[in-house]
């Protein structure tokens, strides 16, 4: 009975040719959508001139199909019981699931103008940049289409810079025709409790973005976990989107299409300040914007983004400190809509449903040499967009799963 089931599970969750897990792992059978909401700035001139609060209005969803491409360069290493691969990136716009088209326009922070003085802090360089910003008629805010904002546009200011730099800017640029990885994960053949756990990423066991243990690559990629998941377990996973490992804790039991699953949620203390959660001390890498590491709910991932002032948070600054959200008007954080969760089938450890929610923000600071930014009286962490990436096991797959796994156990 139970021993046979356990034996079958252990065999079928191994990541090697011929197993149930492998087939779904190579190319997910789940349709994954990524919905975007863009924060349209309502008072750009007032902010640039008077350093007022930024009034935003979210517009969306704009939906893309993602993760539809199979893993590539899959290579088993029988020596250390690992399998390596890359995950190709692709996004297909879904008009029927969107409120508008990819040509819809938004007023957003000028990414290049905000980032340039942050990257180049030398006074002379800023005078040079200022002359180019003026020459290109760029300002603190810009109007861009959805397609440009997400996937890239040629920036008029950067195009004038007299030395070789990338002149294309976009929140996710470059995305299509790129890959994430190389990932090297344990296949579980020798030890099922290590299956899908990442051994290395891009050839390294650490990220080189954070000091101390914050830099570790922990757990899986969240698509699956080692089997026989208990409610008391903390699920650890690495997300390349946020350039860090993070964790989820048991929240509730849920029935998903007749399959009992455990809903694991990202707890608020994962985003807490070192004051509230000392374990987070190594995620605070600068003292000024973080108010001496007392601010919470935003993660400075600049080190992972070539020094650009990119901050990740939960949508609408959910679980963020008041000082972060105070300069922004129009945000309405909501636990149900804006939290991240994973619905994990406990026997197999497979994630059968998930919602990954995150917000991309850019820091803009006063810069006395840059006319477009010199009237600012305080720094702002400006929300650009938030996303909701979701996937749910299909009805057919759910039936098959019930027959082969949960049905047999009952």
């Amino acid at each position: 009975g139970d021993m046979l089931i356990e034996k079958t599970i252990k065999r079928e969750v191994v990541l090697e040719e011929g197993t149930t897990a492998f087939k779904n792992w190579v190319k997910t059978g789940t349709t994954v959508y990524r919905q975007f909401w863009i924060f349209d700035v309502q008072n750009p001139d007032d902010v640039a001139k008077n350093s007022s609060k930024i009034k935003v209005k979210q517009r969306g969803p704009y939906t893309y199909r993602v993760r539809y491409l199979a893993k590539e360069n899959i290579t088993q290493d029988p020596e250390d019981h690992t399998v390596s691969f890359v995950q190709p990136n692709g996004a297909i716009f879904e008009p029927s699931l969107s409120v508008g088209t990819e040509d819809d326009n938004f007023t957003v922070l000028n990414l290049a103008v905000a980032a340039a003085p942050h990257i180049y802090q030398n006074s002379f360089v800023q005078v040079v940049l200022n002359s180019l910003i003026k020459k290109s008629k760029s300002s603190m805010f810009q109007t861009r289409s959805l397609k440009e904002l997400l996937w890239g546009y040629k920036d008029p200011f950067l195009s004038l810079v007299p030395y070789p730099i990338s002149t294309t800017v976009g929140v996710f640029y470059p995305y299509n025709d790129t890959v994430d990885g190389v990932y090297k994960v344990f296949n579980g053949k020798d030890n099922i409790s290590k299956v899908a756990i990442i051994e290395s990423y891009k050839g390294k066991r650490n990220l080189s973005y954070w000091p101390s243990y914050c830099d570790m690559i922990n757990g899986t990629d969240a698509a699956s976990f080692p089997p026989f998941v208990e409610k008391s377990r903390t699920l650890r996973f690495f997300s390349s989107d946020i350039c860090r490992s993070i964790y989820a804790v048991f929240g509730s039991e849920i029935d998903l299409k007749g399959i009992p699953v455990y809903r694991f949620v990202l707890p608020a203390n994962a985003f807490a300040s070192p004051l509230q959660n000392p374990d987070n001390h190594c995620f605070c890498t600068e003292k000024v914007i973080s108010n001496n590491c007392t601010s919470y709910g935003v993660l400075d991932i600049g080190k992972c983004k070539e020094g650009k002032p990119v901050y990740i948070s939960l949508p609408h600054f959910l679980h963020a400190s008041p000082d972060v959200s105070e300069p922004i008007e129009g945000l309405h954080p909501n636990e149900d809509e804006h939290r991240t969760y994973l619905d994990v089938e406990p026997i197999t450890g497979f994630t059968l449903q998930f919602a990954k929610r995150l917000q991309v923000n850019i820091l803009v600071k006063p810069a006395r040499k840059i006319e477009a930014l010199k009237n600012l009286k305080r720094p702002y962490i400006v929300p650009i967009l938030w996303l909701n990436e979701t996937g749910t096991i299909g009805d057919e797959k759910a039936e098959m799963f019930k027959t082969q796994v949960t049905g047999k156990i009952k």
């Epitope: 030398n122 006074s123 002379f124 360089v125 005078v127 200022n130 002359s131 810079v161 007299p162 006395r368």
Partner: antibody, heavy 117, light 107 residues
């Protein structure tokens, strides 16, 4: 101690070119920009241009665009200025200077260039 | 190009007197004005940088004020060692431009 050491005096013929060096020490070369300033005899100072050692990007005053080429060698923390098609008008003392958050806070000792046939 | 008009061209002052030099710019440069002292055979020395900031090690008898287009440099009690040429430099817009200089002598 921050130091900018310039190459010695130059006597060159009209039409020729000359390359002046500015070897820096005592600070991180790539964290500051290097500028060149001309001072004709008994006259005021004139900014020629500046260079960003990190990426070699430079900016010149318009009338020096075809006259001066600014380069750096990061490995030796040295900046160079090449002056071409020299005339007697180019005879002057040329200074290199460092700039960070403050305009030209440290200067080289100056290089005297004499253009004469 | 921002032109910088410096006056006077020369000054003859007695020891202990107050020295005032003025620079006017053709465009608004906020407070991006710097003041230099140059003695014969030496490179210029930065006395006061942007924002009317006295550089470390520079005696407090030197000061400056101004914002926008009008700037004033002051030596409160002139000493014999202050005999030199003085230049203002605007670093607010490209190209950077110097004033024509003020020769300070002892009366």
């Amino acid at each position: 101690e921050v130091q900018l050491q310039q190459s010695g005096p130059e006597l060159v013929k009209p039409g020729a070119s000359v390359k002046i060096s500015c070897k820096t020490s005592g600070y991180t070369f790539t964290e500051y920009t290097i500028h060149w300033v001309k001072q004709s005899h008994g006259k005021s100072l004139e900014w020629i241009g500046g260079i960003i050692p990190n990426n070699g990007g430079s900016s010149h005053k318009q009338n020096f665009k075809d006259k001066a080429t600014l380069t750096v060698d990061k490995s030796s923390s040295t900046a160079y200025m090449e002056l071409r098609s020299l005339t007697s008008e180019d005879s002057a003392v040329y200074y290199c200077a460092r700039a960070g958050d403050y305009a030209f806070d440290y200067w080289g000792q100056g290089t005297t260039l004499t253009v004469s046939s | 190009e921002t032109t910088v008009t410096q006056s006077p061209a020369s000054l003859s002052m007695a020891i202990g007197e107050k020295v005032t030099i003025r620079c006017i710019t053709s465009t608004d440069i906020d407070d991006d004005m710097n003041w230099y002292q140059q003695k014969p055979g030496e490179p210029p020395k930065l006395l006061i940088s942007e924002g009317n900031t006295l550089r470390p090690g520079v005696p407090s008898r030197f000061s400056s004020s101004g914002y926008g287009t009008d700037f004033v440099f002051t030596i409160e009690n002139m000493l014999s060692e202050d005999v030199a040429d003085y230049y203002c430099l605007q670093s607010g817009t490209l190209p950077f431009t110097f004033g024509s200089g003020t020769k300070l002598e002892i009366k």
